[in-house]
Interface confidence: low
């Protein structure tokens, strides 16, 4: 069957039969990703994604990280990874532990970005960055 790039209901079929993401969202492995062009703090970024029926992206596989890095245009984006100082560990916003490496760590950098480098970078939660939202594809 033919795959249409655009449909009248504001959804786009992307890279998978019968699986759709909203317009301007990217499809990858049954998930939809939105890369914002505006910026805000981490808390406001979390609310921004929530307003779109999504969460900040949980980039918990190397394949997902590579996919997102390929489309981030040398920009920095907040993701759903925060440092729990009392535990001395990074956790995704679904509460799962991140055991990988986060560069640029600093006692004031409790949030994380991807996009400008090939790694997860610690960042100030109060500085404005773009954000990546994630939700299930329909």
């Amino acid at each position: 069957p033919q795959i249409f790039n655009k449909s009248n209901d504001g959804f786009t079929t992307t890279r998978s039969y019968g699986t759709v993401c909203p317009k301007d969202w990217e499809f990858y492995q049954a998930r939809c990703f939105f890369l914002s062009t505006s910026e805000s703090s981490w808390n406001e970024s979390r609310d921004f994604c929530k307003g779109k029926g999504s969460t900040l992206a949980i980039v918990n596989t190397p394949e997902k990280l590579k996919f997102l890095q390929d489309i981030t245009d040398a920009e920095k984006y907040f993701i759903g990874l925060i440092y729990h100082r009392e535990e001395k560990r990074w956790r995704w916003i679904n509460n799962s532990v991140f055991n990988g490496n986060v560069t640029n760590q600093n006692q004031n950098f409790n949030c994380a970005t991807i996009g400008l480098t090939k790694t997860f970078d610690a960042a100030s939660c109060d500085i404005s960055y773009r954000r990546i939202c994630e939700k299930n594809a329909k």
Partner: antibody, heavy 122, light 112 residues
Framework: QSLEESGGDLVKPGASLTLTCTAS?????????MCWVRQAPGKCLEWIGC???????TYYASWAKGRFTISKTSSTSVTLQMTRLTAADTATYFC????????????????WGPGTLVTVSS | AIVMTQTPSSKSVPVGDTVTINCQAS????????LAWFQQKPGQPPKLLIY???TLASGVPSRFKGSGSGTHFTLTISDVVPDDAATYYC????????????FGCGTEVVVK
């Protein structure tokens, strides 16, 4: 490439007014911001707010929140809706483009319209 | 909200001299030293001269130089020519969660 503002007028206090900024020779880039800045006669430049073209996110100076609204109406135009106008809103209103705020692209309004005059007087 | 304070408010300078304009931010500007300088002549919109503190905008002569970091920034115009007579504004950016951008109130440069 150019920008042009329109819609400036003489209005009475309490009135509403919508200004339009139209791009010629280019369409708004998804990564750019379209912003409004005003300047009262003989006074400083005053930032009003910006709209991120790609995702529609807007942000405003604290004094403008609730009274001023920036919207994208097409790939080449944005509007500034102003309500409950007072004499203090009398100014020339400029629209300006900021190519990108993110990454290392930095900040700087690289393209401005000539401005449109709004006069609020009874 | 960030507040940008410019000094002096006016400066008279002979042709060929150097003029320095200062801009102080009430708080540190956002990462990458997001501070810009604009030139405005009567009846015209502002023109971008410098962005990210020291990067010259396209077509701007190298006589214009921006420097500084954090809260203190400077615009230096060397070998001043009559066409440099204008009002110069700095603008700082801190991000959407802190009321966005703010302009200084300008420094008028008079060329003698």
């Amino acid at each position: 490439q150019s920008l042009e503002e329109s819609g400036g007028d003489l209005v009475k206090p309490g009135a509403s007014l919508t200004l339009t900024c139209t791009a010629s020779g280019f369409s708004f880039s998804r990564s750019s911001y379209m912003c409004w800045v005003r300047q009262a006669p003989g006074k400083c430049l005053e930032w009003i707010g910006c709209l991120s073209v790609g995702d529609g996110h807007t942000y405003y100076a604290s004094w403008a929140k609730g009274r001023f609204t920036i919207s994208k109406t097409s790939s080449t135009s944005v509007t500034l809706q102003m309500t409950r106008l007072t004499a203090a809103d009398t100014a020339t209103y400029f629209c300006a483009r900021a190519p990108s705020y993110s990454g290392d692209g930095g900040h700087g309004y690289d393209l401005w319209g000539p401005g449109t005059l709004v006069t609020v007087s009874s | 909200a960030i507040v940008m304070t410019q000094t002096p408010s006016s400066k008279s300078v002979p042709v060929g001299d150097t003029v320095t304009i200062n801009c102080q931010a009430s708080e540190s500007v956002d990462r990458n030293n997001r501070l810009a300088w604009f030139q405005q002549k009567p009846g015209q919109p502002p023109k971008l001269l410098i962005y990210t503190t020291s990067t010259l905008a396209s077509g701007v002569p190298s006589r214009f130089k921006g420097s500084g970091s954090g809260t203190h920034f400077t615009l230096t115009i060397s070998d001043v020519v009559p066409d440099d007579a204008a009002t110069y504004y700095c603008a700082g950016y801190r991000g959407a969660h802190t009321d966005g951008d703010a302009f200084g109130c300008g420094t008028e440069v008079v060329v003698k």
